[in-house]
Amino acid sequence: YDFTNCDFEKIKAAYLSTISKDLITYMSGTKSTEFNNTVSCSNRPHCLTEIQSLTFNPTAGCASLAKEMFAMKTKAALAIWCPGYSETQINATQAMKKRRKRKVTTNKCLEQVSQLQGLWRRFNRPLLKQQ
């Protein structure tokens, strides 16, 4: 999906008002220095591409973050503010099925969510030059 035509300011508002709090809740009990940020992004569409990938694609050691509250809110924000996102990224019938129970939080998942926090912070500061 091409995130170029999203309403970035509206997505930023959703992040600041609610998604960020859920990410913090997920990471509670973890030191902020525990994980190094290894995933980066260069501009807002790129950041959303990376956020989408880390949030919804299963990885080794962290099978699914998609059922977490921050992920459902991310999906909702993208569905609302990115034209055509729902049609290309979400199966309508899937969206209406009952959710499965949450997976156990692993250290790998915590590391992945820590990367997500970094990507979101970068998304919110698009004018900063890449380190």
């Epitope: 309403d7 509206k10 959703a14 008002s17 609610t18 998604i19 459902m72 809110k73 999906k75 909702a76 924000a77 569905a79 609302i80 503010w81 034209p83 055509g84 729902s86 049609e87 979400i90 309508a92 969206a95 209406m96």
Partner: antibody, heavy 120, light 111 residues
Framework: QVQLVQSGAEVKKPGSSVKVSCKAS????????INWVRQAPGQGLEWLGV????????IYAEKFQGRVTITADTSTSTAYMELSSLRSEDTAVYYC?????????????WGQGTLVTVSS | QSALTQPPSASGSPGQSVTISCTGT?????????VSWYQQHPGKAPKLMIY???KRPSGVPDRFSGSKSGNTASLTVSGLQAEDEADYYC???????????FGGGTKLTVL
């Protein structure tokens, strides 16, 4: 069962405000969109706006911007639509309608409607 | 935004097919695959019949079908039955985050 139940009919004076409620049951309220649509007597359907409680997003139709306020109370699974500065042309049946999860623009469940009459 | 354009009336005999058109612009119907159709009987709330241009919710008979070409969407009711007599409204997502831009409605009469 899965339903939206709206508050009863209202009679209002021009210039006043009306607040209509819409109580959801049988589904996860926060995950869906709650849209408000009205229908004047003998006329077509007109969209007023939507709230997606999960992310606290509200969007209003340009025509009603500044005059309509949509809110939601997730603890009671209830959405509200308040319309201010009422005029006779606002006399209509007001419906709340559920927008599908992540596809908030498809209204797959409707309330029974609330008749709002604006008359002096 | 202006309302989508629908013919005020349409009719057909039982067993026949009827197609109702809904014309918009590239900012609504033409720009998004987010067209839906609603059936409304007198004194009742509308009911979703078609969404996503051509998808049918469960419980809606397969006699109802939807399509889109350019800026025009269409609803076809085949094998008309008496209970199909109702008002039909098209709706489209429109630019500027309008979730429901409706047509003026078409009164379908089963002769």
């Amino acid at each position: 069962q899965v339903q939206l139940v709206q508050s009863g009919a209202e009679v209002k004076k021009p210039g006043s405000s009306v607040k209509v409620s819409c109580k959801a049951s049988g589904f996860t309220f926060g995950s869906y969109g709650i849209n408000w649509v009205r229908q004047a007597p003998g006329q077509g359907l007109e969209w007023l706006g939507v709230i997606v409680p999960l992310v606290g997003v509200t969007i209003y139709a340009e025509k009603f911007q500044g005059r309509v306020t949509i809110t939601a109370d997730t603890s009671t699974s209830t959405a509200y639509m308040e319309l201010s500065s009422l005029r006779s042309e606002d006399t209509a049946v007001y419906y709340c309608a559920r927008g599908q999860e992540y596809f908030y623009w498809y209204f797959d469940l409707w309330g029974q409607g609330t008749l709002v009459t604006v008359s002096s | 935004q202006s309302a989508l354009t629908q013919p005020p009336s349409a009719s057909g005999s039982p067993g026949q097919s009827v197609t109702i058109s809904c014309t918009g612009t590239s900012s609504d119907i033409g720009g998004y695959d987010r067209v839906s159709w609603y059936q409304q009987h007198p004194g009742k709330a509308p009911k979703l019949m078609i969404y996503g241009v051509s998808k049918r919710p469960s419980g809606v008979p397969d006699r109802f079908s939807g399509s889109k070409s350019g800026n025009t969407a269409s609803l076809t009711v085949s094998g008309l039955q008496a209970e199909d007599e109702a008002d039909y409204y098209c709706s489209s997502y429109a630019s500027g985050h309008t979730f429901g831009l409706f047509g003026g409605g078409t009164k379908l009469t089963v002769l």
